[in-house]
């Protein structure tokens, strides 16, 4: 099921920023998400149950984000023009056991300005 | 190895005041939300309030919602309850335990409150 | 607030014989896939120990004669064959909302 999540669209543009999405089983109950940049954390989110079953999540990066059953959204608005990066999705699955660490959806990104008009965004699977 | 150790208890008139404390070792503390679970003597287990990973979070049974509250020190390795306004109904042992996801994986032996005049 | 009962009260097996304990819950616990039930096990004079989360599944450890089964507001565990030292308290507990609850407990003895 973690091996047929890389088969969606990752990246999408709106309002000058970039939304980069992160697909994960709607069977996860607790997880962390994180994506990375190249070889470094830019975001870094937690969901995690308590006993009561009260949901709490945790973004120490305070990256802008959006959580559903089924993915995270992390909104980026700083992509540097003119320069390529690697962003990588990883989740580790704490809920249902067994706990699971994966490396999920990657892609290249590439923006650069046009001298006429406007930024242009480029994405390689 | 988990290890969960519970100190603080000890015998209190009504009314009067206690704070517990479990000193937690052999797991990231930061990483779980912890809970306070009673049982009275000779009886069952009673789930008494729990706090998230950050302490942001915190939950009371009705029982002692308004006069017990739950903290943490992260730096510490440390899990506390205050216990205010206690009345004779408090009386029980009181276990740390640890939420690990999907149930109380690991508790402490426990402390003995004894709330009597 | 849920409210979980337990039966029997109390029930005495013969060892290598199979004891079962039921447990109810006043509403269902089933969410998506999953039941947020638990079970515990108490020996005297010692912290309970986690057997079954989810209903079914046996948490790290725990002997294959413990079971879990059941769905939504039925649930129940079996020991397949009692050893003895399964002497003990059996509790459920739900996790479905706040406040989570206990069972009264199910005491079980050797015949």
């Known amino acids: 099921e973690l091996n047929d999540l890389a088969n969606h669209r990752m990246f999408s543009f709106h309002d000058g920023g970039v939304q980069i999405s992160c697909n994960y089983p709607e069977t996860v109950q607790q997880l962390k998400m994180q994506l990375f940049k190249d070889r470094e954390v830019l975001c870094d989110l937690t969901k995690t149950k308590g006993s009561g079953n009260t949901v709490s999540i945790k973004n120490p990066m305070s990256c802008p984000y959006q959580l559903s059953n089924n993915s995270v959204s992390f909104f980026l608005d700083n992509a540097d023009s003119s320069q390529g990066s690697y962003f990588l999705c990883s989740l580790s699955i704490f809920d249902p056991p067994p706990f699971q660490e994966k490396n999920l959806s990657g892609g290249y990104l590439l923006i650069y300005e046009s001298q006429l008009c406007c930024q242009l965004k480029l994405w390689l699977p | 190895e988990v290890q969960l150790v519970e100190s603080g208890g000890g015998l209190v008139q009504p009314g009067g005041s206690l704070r517990l404390s479990c000193a937690a070792s052999?797991?990231?503390?930061?990483?779980?939300?912890m809970d306070w679970v009673r049982q009275a003597p000779g009886k069952g287990l009673v789930w008494v309030s729990n706090?998230?990973?950050?302490?942001?979070?915190?939950e009371y049974s009705p029982f002692v919602k308004g006069r017990f509250t739950i903290s943490r020190d992260n730096a510490k390795n440390t899990l506390y309850l205050q216990m205010n306004s206690l009345r004779a109904e408090d009386t029980a042992v009181y276990y740390c335990t640890r939420w690990g996801r999907f149930g109380f994986d690991s508790w402490g032996q426990g402390t003995l409150v004894t709330v009597s005049s | 607030d849920i409210v979980m009962t337990q039966s029997p009260d109390s029930l005495a097996v013969s060892l290598g014989e199979r004891a079962t304990i039921n447990c109810k819950s006043s509403?269902?616990?089933?969410?998506?896939?999953?039941?947020?039930l638990t079970w515990y096990q108490q020996k005297p004079g010692q912290p309970p120990k986690l057997l079954i989360f989810?209903?079914?599944t046996r948490h790290t450890g725990v002997p294959d004669r413990f079971s879990g089964s059941g769905s939504g507001t039925d649930f129940t565990l079996t020991i397949s064959s009692l050893q003895a030292e399964d002497v003990a308290v059996y509790y459920c507990?739900?996790?479905?909302?706040?406040?989570?609850?206990f069972g009264p407990g199910t005491k079980v003895d050797i015949k």
């Open positions: 052999g797991f990231t503390f930061s990483d779980y939300w």
């Open positions: 507990h739900h996790h479905y909302n706040a406040p989570p609850t």
């Open positions: 509403q269902s616990l089933l969410s998506g896939s999953f039941n947020y």
């Open positions: 989810y209903a079914s």
């Open positions: 706090i998230d990973e950050d302490g942001s979070i915190t």
